[in-house]
Interface confidence: low
C-alpha cells in the first residue's frame, strides 16, 4: 500500500518553478517572487541567492534557476558557485591579512591574485638569465654560455604562468 | 569561554541519514565561518565542507556532494551537518571547527575562510552497524 | 583532491628537533599561503599549532615553527619534550574551492 500511494504521490508532478502546496490540497503552485525550484515535485521553492555588495549579478534568478553572481571590478571569484570574493591586487604584490603587499626580492607576481612565486633558477637547466627577474615578471632563461656560438638556439621562453586562485574545474 | 558542544554518540543502520549538532558559544556565531571535519577509526582527518552561519552558504567536498547538508540555526547559535545514505565507510568521529578568520555577512562583504581551525567540538561518534 | 603527503612517522630524542614535512602539489600547498598544522593526542580534537604557514596562535609554544617552500611545507619542533607525542597533520586550501589534510604523521618521543 506504501508504495502504490508514493507511486500516486501527486507531488511528483509538479515541474520545476512551482512547489507542492500542502496548504491547498498539493496542488503546483508557481514559486512566490525572488524564489525558484530547479527540479519537479519540491514541497518548497528555494530563496533567490541576492548578488549583493561586492557581488554583482552575473545571471537573474528565473522561477526555475537561482541566480549567479560575480564580483565587481577590483575583485575576484574564490569559492565554489563564486561564494566568496577576494580583492585584487596589482601585478608584482600578493594579498596578505594586511592587504596588499608588494613581492619580495627573487620572486613575481604576474598576476592580479594569488601569490608571489619564486624566480626560475636557470642555471639548475644549465642555462643563464637573459633577462632579470622583476616583482611582475619571471626572469628570462637563455642558452648556457658554452651554447653562444654561431648558430646557438634561440631564447627558450619562461613556462607560461599559473592562476593559483582560479578553480581549474 | 569561547566552545562548541557537539551532540554525543549516534548509531545507525545502513541506509540511514544522520543529523549532527554544533552548538556554538563565547562568540558571534554568524561572524565565523565553521568547517566539518571527519575522522574514521585510526584514520586521518578528512574535510567535509563549510558554512558561513550569516547568509548560510556552503561549500562541500566533492566526496559528499549529494549526500551531505550543512545548515545553521542563528537564533541558537547552532550548525548542523546531516549526512545520508549511510554505510559503513561512513562510521567516524564527526568534528565541528570554527575557522580562525573573523568573516562577513555573505551577501554584503567578502572574506576568504583561513582554513585554519582554531576552535574544535569533542566530536560525535557516529557507527554505522547492520 | 588527494589527500598531502606526509611521513607516517617520525621519532626523536627529549632536546632534539625534529621536522615533518607535507608535500603537496601547485593546487594547493604550492599555490596559496593558507598551510595549517595540527597537533591531536589520543582520544582528542586536534589543536591548530601553525596557521598561514608561519603564524603561531597565542598560547602555543615557541618551539613550534612553520615554513614552505615550492610545493612542500614543514613543521619543525625544536627542544622535543615528551609531552610533544601526538598525531600531527597539516592541512591546505586548494585551487577547487575546498580543503586537503595530510595523511597524519606519528611523533614518538624516544
Known amino acids: 500500500f506504501e508504495r502504490t500511494r508514493s507511486l500516486q504521490d501527486p507531488c511528483s508532478n509538479c515541474p520545476a518553478g512551482t512547489f507542492c502546496d500542502n496548504n491547498r490540497n498539493q496542488i503546483c503552485s508557481p514559486c512566490p517572487p525572488n524564489s525558484f525550484s530547479s527540479a519537479g515535485g519540491q514541497r518548497t521553492c528555494d530563496i533567490c541567492r541576492q548578488c549583493k555588495g561586492v557581488f554583482r549579478t552575473r545571471k537573474e534568478c528565473s522561477s526555475t534557476s537561482n541566480a549567479e553572481c560575480d564580483c565587481t571590478p577590483g575583485f575576484h571569484c574564490l569559492g565554489a558557485g563564486c561564494s566568496m570574493c577576494e580583492q585584487d591586487c596589482k601585478q608584482g604584490q600578493e594579498l596578505t591579512k594586511k592587504g596588499c603587499k608588494d613581492c619580495c626580492f627573487g620572486t613575481f607576481n604576474d598576476q592580479k591574485r594569488g601569490i608571489c612565486r619564486p624566480w626560475t633558477n636557470c642555471s639548475l637547466d644549465g642555462k643563464s638569465v637573459l633577462v632579470n627577474g622583476t616583482k611582475e615578471r619571471d626572469v628570462v632563461c637563455g642558452p648556457s654560455p658554452a651554447d653562444l656560438s654561431p648558430g646557438a638556439s634561440s631564447v627558450t621562453p619562461p613556462a607560461p604562468a599559473r592562476e593559483p586562485g582560479h578553480s581549474p574545474q | 569561554e569561547v566552545q562548541l558542544v557537539e551532540t554525543g554518540v549516534e548509531v545507525k543502520k545502513p541506509g540511514a541519514s544522520v543529523k549532527v549538532s554544533c552548538k556554538a558559544s563565547g562568540y558571534t556565531f554568524t561572524s565565523y565561518y565553521m568547517h566539518w571535519v571527519r575522522q574514521a577509526p585510526g584514520q586521518g582527518l578528512e574535510w567535509m565542507g563549510i558554512i558561513n552561519p550569516s547568509g548560510g552558504s556552503t561549500s562541500y567536498a566533492q566526496k559528499f556532494q549529494g549526500r551531505v547538508t550543512m545548515t545553521r540555526d542563528t537564533s541558537t547559535s547552532t550548525a548542523y551537518m546531516e549526512l545520508s545514505s549511510l554505510r559503513s565507510e561512513d562510521t567516524a568521529v564527526y568534528y565541528c571547527?570554527?575557522?580562525?578568520?573573523?568573516?562577513?555577512?555573505?551577501?554584503?562583504?567578502?572574506?576568504?575562510?583561513?582554513?585554519?581551525?582554531?576552535?574544535w567540538g569533542k566530536g560525535t561518534m557516529v557507527t554505522v552497524s547492520s | 583532491q588527494s589527500a598531502l603527503t606526509q611521513p607516517a612517522s617520525v621519532s626523536g630524542s627529549p632536546g632534539q628537533s625534529i621536522t615533518i614535512s607535507c608535500t603537496g602539489t601547485?593546487?594547493?600547498?604550492?599555490?596559496?599561503?593558507?598551510v595549517s598544522w595540527y597537533q591531536q593526542r589520543p582520544g582528542k580534537a586536534p589543536k591548530l599549532i601553525i596557521y598561514d604557514v608561519t603564524t603561531r596562535p597565542s598560547g602555543v609554544s615557541n618551539r613550534f615553527s612553520g615554513s614552505k617552500s615550492g610545493t612542500t611545507a614543514s613543521l619543525t619542533i625544536s627542544g622535543l619534550q615528551a609531552e610533544d607525542e601526538a598525531d600531527y597533520y597539516c592541512?591546505?586550501?586548494?585551487?577547487?574551492?575546498?580543503?586537503?589534510f595530510g595523511g597524519g604523521t606519528k611523533l614518538t618521543v624516544l
Open positions: 601547485s593546487s594547493d600547498v604550492g599555490g596559496y599561503n593558507y
Open positions: 592541512s591546505s586550501y586548494t585551487s577547487y574551492s575546498t580543503w586537503v
Open positions: 571547527a570554527r575557522d580562525l578568520g573573523e568573516g562577513y555577512d555573505f551577501w554584503s562583504g567578502y572574506y576568504t575562510p583561513s582554513g585554519a581551525f582554531d576552535i
